[in-house]
């Protein structure tokens, strides 16, 4: 046999070169018979009337011949006939490869609510073969069930991938990335996911600035309530007790001025939207106004030495010398 | 001059044989596959037989299969056809031609008369 | 086995354009090529592949393919231009051969 081919696999659209190789050439008469057999060059003469067919080269070597917009319907074996005695045939066999049509993602609701599992399908349209498809949950990647289906040789798969959304993942990428021979870089789809949480509330002391509330002072804090939807309603209670007479609310704030020991107590800010609601509690300790250090009778030097107090807010109940806040959610 | 010269034919009862040649001259012989095509009295072309340029292959209309043998050797730059078993439809001009899927190049023709 | 159908005469004036056709299976697949013969000669090929004139063929010899018909097309006949013309192709196979029943032309004037 000195009759030789190689395979070749091709893109769907671009072009294959089919090649007929002869080692020991003795000016025998060479065709090129496609799947069907029919004849596409005979020597240097394509009688064969798809003019997708091109000659490249011609010798008593080689006959080399290129196929242009290659469709999968032309996939198959491609005779070399070599017609020495007694004759010799080789084949190539073409392999189409075809990148998906279309990428589609689908996802079960627009909307998710924090704690739910929603389903989210992407579809990868007739490829061949079938394709690969992966799932990422921003840079995470997660793992999806796939499903292949095959129509006259082409393949369409769709993955589904069942999804646990927390608040975090608001906002947060779900992409279906592909991967298939015929297709080289990243083809991928996303969509974005919509999680609504309930609100999360915090409680921020804006006045006094050092944290220490002492009788005569006033106090201001802001009620810092997120969620999604947003709330609409930040609402200011004291628990167990009637708010102070002297206590102003205006949205979100609650100002409280001169403060004095009867207002001591828990005082709670509630948010909610329609997912559900929650609160932050502070706890309110007024100490005594500062007493007031009369100054020396006698000329003396002294060295004054400022103690410098760091004062936080903690996030339990203890009793303690400033006040507290406690976030509760319910 | 590149030409085909055939010779061989002639009158021969049904039943007979009759051997033609083709002698080929002006180009590489074996480098081509020829044909045989006969002509009948009055009548249209009718491709008889093949043979690829080493003889390794060869091809032939239904109506003489079996009875009919094409060969060559070129070493003579010569095309041959075997005619056995004649019958009085065989009668026509049998012409050689070389065979570059299209016919190029044709003889003058050898006239084979099958009668009783 | 494939059959090519030719119409068995066709006549045009001088210097007009005449159309020969050939149809029959093959030809959706293949090319046909076209040979004119002369009384008391052998054939000669005029045209092949999609079209191909061979050397010494005057240019208004012309070919033409469209599903399974192949055409010979003549532009401006002349007196010499008189003879049967032969369409012939492949079987499926490329392997045996076929030719159309030849079309008689007449020129006239």
């Known amino acids: 046999q000195n009759l030789f081919t190689k395979d070749v696999t091709v893109i769907e659209g671009e072009v294959a070169t089919i090649s007929c190789q002869v080692n020991k050439s003795d000016d025998s008469v060479i065709q090129l018979l496609n799947p069907n057999r029919q004849t596409i060059y005979f020597r240097d003469f394509r009688p064969l009337k798809d003019s997708r067919f091109q000659l490249l080269n011609f010798s008593s070597s080689e006959l080399k011949v290129s196929l242009t917009n290659v469709s999968i319907s032309d996939e198959g074996r491609y005779f070399c006939q070599l017609y020495t005695d007694p004759p010799q045939e080789s084949y190539t066999t073409i392999t189409v490869l075809v990148p998906p049509r279309n990428l589609m993602i689908d996802i079960q609701r627009d909307t998710a609510v924090e704690g739910e599992e929603i389903e989210v399908n992407c579809t990868a349209m007739a490829s061949k073969p079938a394709t690969t498809i992966r799932w990422f949950k921003g840079n995470t990647e997660l793992k999806g069930k796939s499903e292949v289906e095959e129509w006259s040789d082409m393949y369409t798969v769709t993955s589904q991938l069942m999804l646990k959304v927390h608040k975090e993942d608001d906002g947060v990428p779900v992409i279906c990335q592909v991967e298939h021979p015929a297709v080289t870089g990243n083809l991928q789809t996303q969509r974005y996911l919509e999680v609504q949480y309930k609100p999360q509330v915090h409680i921020q002391m804006t006045y006094p600035l050092q944290g220490l509330t002492r009788e005569g002072d006033a106090l201001e804090l802001t009620c810092e309530a997120i969620g999604k939807p947003q709330p609409v309603m930040v609402t200011w209670v004291r628990v167990d007790d009637e708010m102070p007479q002297h206590a102003v609310l205006s949205g979100p704030n609650l100002f409280i001025n001169n403060l004095n020991k009867t207002d001591n107590g828990t005082y709670r800010c509630e948010a909610s939207n329609i997912v559900g609601k929650a609160h932050s509690d502070y706890m309110l300790y007024v100490y005594d106004p500062p007493t007031t250090i009369p100054p020396p009778t006698t000329t003396t030097t002294t060295t004054t030495t400022t103690t410098t107090t760091i004062l936080t807010i903690i996030t339990d109940s203890r009793a303690g010398e400033e006040g507290s806040i406690r976030a509760v959610d319910h | 001059e590149v030409q085909l010269v055939e010779s061989g034919g002639g009158l021969v009862k049904p039943g007979g044989s009759l051997r033609l040649s083709c002698a080929a001259s002006?180009?590489?012989?074996?480098?081509?596959?020829m044909s045989w095509v006969r002509q009948a009295p009055g009548k249209g072309l009718e491709w008889v037989s093949a043979?690829?340029?080493?003889?390794?292959?060869?091809y032939y209309a239904d109506s003489v299969k079996g009875r009919f043998t094409i060969s060559r050797d070129n070493s003579k730059n010569t095309l041959y056809l075997q005619m056995n078993s004649l019958r009085a439809e065989d009668t026509a001009l049998y012409y050689c031609?070389?065979?570059?899927?299209?016919?190029?190049?044709w003889g003058r023709g050898t006239l084979v008369t099958v009668s009783s | 086995s494939s059959e090519l159908t030719q119409d068995p005469a066709v006549s045009v004036a001088l210097g007009q354009t005449v159309r020969i056709t050939c149809q029959g299976d093959?030809?959706?697949?293949?090319?046909a090529s076209w040979y004119q013969q002369k009384p008391g000669q052998a054939p000669v090929l005029v045209i092949y592949g999609k079209n191909n004139r061979l050397s010494g063929i005057p240019d208004r010899f012309s070919g033409s393919s469209s599903g399974n018909t192949a055409s010979l097309t003549i532009t401006g006949a002349q007196a010499e231009d008189e003879a049967d013309y032969y369409c012939?192709?492949?079987?499926?196979?490329?392997?045996?051969?076929?030719f159309g029943g030849g079309t008689k032309l007449t020129v006239l004037g």
């Open positions: 031609a070389r065979d570059n899927w299209y016919f190029d190049l």
């Open positions: 043979i690829s340029g080493s003889g390794g292959s060869t």
């Open positions: 093959s030809l959706r697949s293949y090319y």
């Open positions: 012939n192709s492949r079987d499926s196979s490329g392997n045996h051969v076929v």
């Open positions: 002006g180009f590489t012989f074996s480098s081509y596959a």
